[in-house]
Structure formats: C-alpha cells, structure tokens
C-alpha cells in the first residue's frame, strides 16, 4: 500500500485502564499530531481505522467489532471497551486515511488488575491539599463522556479499603469529596467508584488518587537561612580544608522553584580561579517544606581565600535572601622560646582567641 505518515509508538500516552471496567480511548492523532479534529477529517472523506498488536506478539490484527454485546466498539474518534478484559493489553493503532492521504499513530494500552483495596500498578495522580486551610475538594477524575447527563450515577468514596461516610472532616458530596479541614492524617489514597446503568447492564468506573497534605500558603514565609549565621566563625589556617554549609528552609509553595547558590566576592564559584566544590542535599518535612543544604568546600585554603567574601543566597516565590559567612585566618598561638618560658616560670601553652564555635 502507499506510504503512510507513521508517528510511531506514542509512549507518552501510556494508557492504563482497569480490568472489567468501561474504557473510552480517544485516537491521539487529533489530540497531539494533526492540526485538525475528527469532524473536519470525517467531512473531508477521511476514514479512521483501528487495529492492534497483542502483548508479546508482532502481528498487527484488526480489532474485532463483532463481539457479543458490542464489547469493543468505535464511536467517532473514540475506541470503546464495555468492559475491558485482561488480554486487551497491547499496542493499539489508529490510522486516518483516504486514497491520497494516510497518517497513523500507535499507543500502548495496559489493562491492569486491582485488589480489594484498589491497589494496582496504575500510576496515581497526586492532589495536594493545604493543611488546616478551610474547605478544599477533590473531584472524581476522568469520568466525562462515559454516560449522558440524564443518567444519575451512584458515587461511593473510599480511603484505601474503607468507605467514607459520616466522618467529621471528610464529606462525600457526589463527584466531590470535601475536606472541611485537612490534617496530616488525611494523607492517603482516595478512590471514587462511579456506578451507572447502560442498556440494562451496570458498569463501574474506579478512579484512585493520592492526597498529600502540604504546608499552607497562610503560613508560608520567605526562605530562612539557618547557616551561615552570626554565631559561627569559620577560622582556618592556610592549607586546611574550608567547609561552609549553607542551610536554607523553604516553606511549601505550590509550583515554586526553590534556589540556593553561593557567591564568592560577588561572583559565581565557577567564575573564580580557585578549586571549589559544592555539594547539595535536600530533605522534606511531612508537609513538603524543604530544607536545602549546599556545602561549599575548598580543599586547601590559601590566605587569599580567607580574605574573600562568601555569601549564601536563597530564592523562592516568597522572596530572596542572602547571608555572608564570617571567614577568618586563624592567628597562630604565640610560640615561646624555652628560655622565655623558663624565665616566666610558664607551665602551660598560650591559647588562641575565643569564639562561639570553631569550624
């Protein structure tokens, strides 16, 4: 047959559906690859053809649209399963063509099994709720188009295996689940099961999402630099290793980019002709507040390096802060001659200057 524009296997669309549930899958051509929609294509006399390759097979085969009860059907640019079976797993191709034009794309479809508590290999969307923030809602996702608006489905909400009912701060309200006030204990997987009738049959749609309770914007503050600070002096002799940690606390902020960086004499470390290494570590609190530590390290510090200005900078959506480290060259302790020591009757050695901390 004539050449066809083949967009290959669209692994970005790793579609996962539950076994024994309805699934409606739109041909990705119109969503991601072509500049026109199905209606335009149909009006122009183009035909949409579906076929598939079973899991662990190489043979492309047509989809059987003559199964009992129309288990698999096509409607416009949508491939319907009512319901799916485990062995529907495979790579599906939709091809748009007429005598002069052809374009096709394949995508993987995985039919997955769930257990009695709705655990499965399915990748779960994460919904973040602000801690102690007031009423917030999650909505049962991806159920549009399964039944007409005239059908009133039954929706049951679960946390893990357990039905949510009559609970003081989490209230099921149809397609929504309302959290009157969210606490850390509300973290977990929440599942809505949507039950609806169709042609004398009853179908179930299961949708699970992970709720993560995070820091509230009410409590958000600009970055806080814990180190360096005014209590710590980095006092070194030439030839010693200089290690200065920059430790910064960031409040959780939705979609905020947290940044930490060092400057040496007002320049980026890369722009200074000294051998500097910077190691970063990141930790998170239960509400996703972040602590970033960048340790600046100079293996063998020179007296020149000890005169430089070392400044830790931090930035988030809440603002920018900076703090300089106090770096000094250690003053050597006086070295008495034996004669002088005897003359003064000294028995101990002189001590260096005192600071709160020495690093």
């Amino acid at each position: 047959s004539e050449r066809c524009d083949d967009w290959g296997l669209d692994t970005m669309r790793q579609i996962q559906v539950f076994e024994d549930e309805p699934a409606r899958i739109k041909c990705p051509l119109f969503e991601h690859f072509l500049k026109f929609n199905y209606s335009t294509a149909h009006s122009a006399g183009l035909t949409l053809i579906w076929y598939w390759t079973r899991q662990d097979r190489d043979l492309e085969e047509p989809i059987n649209f003559r199964l009992p009860e129309n288990r698999i059907s096509k409607e416009k640019d949508v491939l319907w399963f009512r319901p799916t079976l485990l062995n529907d797993t495979g790579n599906y191709t939709c091809m748009l063509r007429n005598t002069t034009y052809c374009s096709k794309v394949a995508f993987p479809l995985e039919v997955v099994q769930k257990d009695s508590c709705f655990n499965s290999p399915m990748k779960l969307p994460v919904h973040k709720l602000y801690i102690e923030y007031g009423i917030q809602r999650i909505t049962c996702p991806n159920v549009d188009g399964y039944f007409p608006s005239s059908v009133k489905p039954t929706i049951t909400w679960y946390m893990g295996c357990y039905k949510i009912q009559n609970f003081n701060n989490v209230i099921p309200e149809g397609m929504n689940l309302s959290f009157l006030i969210a606490f850390i204990s509300n973290n977990g997987n929440y599942t809505c099961v949507v039950t609806y009738p169709e042609n004398g049959r009853t179908f179930h749609l299961t949708r699970t999402l992970t709720v993560k309770v995070v820091g509230s914007p009410k409590n958000a503050v600009p970055p806080v630099i814990h180190s360096p600070n005014d209590h710590v002096v980095y006092e070194k002799e030439p030839g010693e290793e200089l290690l200065i940690p920059c430790t910064v606390y960031f409040s959780f902020l939705m979609d905020s980019r947290n940044e930490v960086w060092w400057t040496i004499d007002g320049k980026k470390p890369d722009d200074i002709p000294i051998d500097v290494t910077i190691n970063e570590s990141i930790s998170h609190s239960r509400t996703e507040d972040e602590t970033r530590t960048q340790i600046l390290s100079i293996k063998k510090v020179t007296s020149e390096d000890l005169k430089r200005s070392y400044v830790c900078h931090a930035r988030s959506a809440k603002g920018e802060v900076a703090k300089a480290a106090t770096v000094k060259q250690k003053v050597p302790a006086p070295r008495y001659t034996v004669e002088l020591a005897c003359g003064f009757g000294a028995t101990g050695s002189g001590s260096g200057s005192h600071h709160h901390h020495h690093h």
Epitope: Q113, C117, Y162
Partner: antibody
C-alpha cells in the same frame, strides 16, 4: 515498636455475645486499619472483617454479616470486635491484626484471645 | 469467594533442605497474595506480601513467586526455627481468604 495487646480469654454461653478488645501502641492509630481473624482449634485462619481507625467504617465477610460488629476508639487507640448469637462452632482464638488503610496484608498481630462457647 | 488450596498438607524435611510450598487460587488473584508463618501457640507472622516481597526482618532464605493462580513459597535451606505451619492469603477480592495451611515438620 508496634504492639497490639488483646483482652483476656472468655468463656461464653451459646446465644450470648462476646466483645474482644485490641489496644494498639507504637504507631499512629489513625494511619492504620485493624482486621479480625479467627482460628478454630486445629483449624486454619478465617478473616472476619476490618475497620478503618480514622473513618470508623468497617468491611465484613458475608459469613459474619449481621452477627459481628467491629468498632474503633481513636482516643484510646483501641479496636473492638463483638460477636453475637454465639454457638459452639465460634470457639476459637480471635486475633486482631494491623494493616494500612489500603493494605491487604496483615503486618502486625495481637497475641490472640481464646473465646470458648460452651453450655 | 476465592478458595486457596495449599499443597502438600504436610512437608517432612530435614534442616538444611529446601522447602517448596504451593498455593493455588480458584481464580486469578494477580499478585495480591501474602504468606504467613505460624508456630504453635503464637500469632501468625507476615513473611511475604505482593507475592514476592519479603516483609521487614524476614531472612533472605524465604522467597515468594507466582502470579495469577499459582504461587510458591520457597525456603532455600531450612533452619530449625522454620518448622511451622505456613498460610497463603489473597486480598484481590472480598472476603479476604486464607489457604488451609501447609505444615513443615522435621523428618
């Protein structure tokens, strides 16, 4: 570490009820669910039902529906299993066991409570 | 409900030998299966979950495999403390059910 401590052995008359308690320590009670499993003398294990500590809602095995009530008291980190209309075949060791809200395996178990039903 | 059938009912082996225990489900339970060990007068102890994941603190000589309807618990080299009754349990469907148990006894 996590501990589940159950109430002591009980001897009951047929037709009566028994209520067994299970006190949890060493973990956040509200983050878990508690299931009850029984074992008749010389027999295997039988899952009766479970409860979410945070929501207080329970799931029951059909076999025990209407005869068993599982409850949880978050304030005392204690779960309870009440079995009514007792008969001689209910003589068994009753275990409570902890699992995640969405967990299907029982990772910590109580020591068991022997309930003897005899006239 | 799903019926789990364990075989053999009794396994007579010596310390150091390999033990292979089987659990068959009446219908597919995917990999939603756990294994427990129970010693006389004690509560069961979780060994394996998700068909093949060792629980915390369980020695590496215990391993689980299988998916769908057929599962195996293997003890690579029996230690004296491994002689006990072993149960499989499925969580794919309500109610959760257990197998009738396999007793591993000293030969």
């Amino acid at each position: 570490q996590v501990q589940l401590v159950q109430s002591g052995a009980e001897v009951k008359k047929p037709g009566s009820s028994v209520k067994v308690s299970c006190k949890a320590s060493g973990g956040t009670f509200s983050s878990y669910a508690i299931s009850w499993v029984r074992q008749a003398p010389g027999q295997g294990l039988e899952w009766m039902g479970g409860i979410s500590a945070i929501f207080g809602t329970a799931n029951y095995a059909q076999k025990f529906q209407g005869r068993v009530t599982i409850t949880a008291d978050e304030s005392t980190s204690t779960a309870y299993m009440e079995l009514s209309s007792l008969r001689s075949e209910d003589t068994a060791v009753y275990y409570c066991a902890r699992h995640l809200h969405n967990g299907i395996h029982l990772d910590y178990w109580g020591q068991g409570t022997l309930v003897t039903v005899s006239s | 409900e799903i019926v789990l059938t364990q075989s053999p009912a009794t396994l007579s082996l010596s310390p150091g030998e390999r033990a292979t225990l089987s659990c068959r489900a009446s219908q597919s339970v995917s990999n939603f299966l756990a294994w427990y060990q129970q010693k006389p007068g004690q509560a069961p102890r979780l060994l394996i979950y998700g068909a093949s994941n060792r629980a915390t603190g369980i020695p590496a000589r215990f391993s689980g495999s299988g998916s769908g309807t057929d599962f195996t618990l293997t003890i690579s080299s029996l230690e004296p403390e491994d002689f006990a009754v072993y149960y499989c349990q499925q969580g794919k469907h309500w109610p959760w059910t257990f197998g009738q148990g396999t007793k591993v006894e000293i030969k």
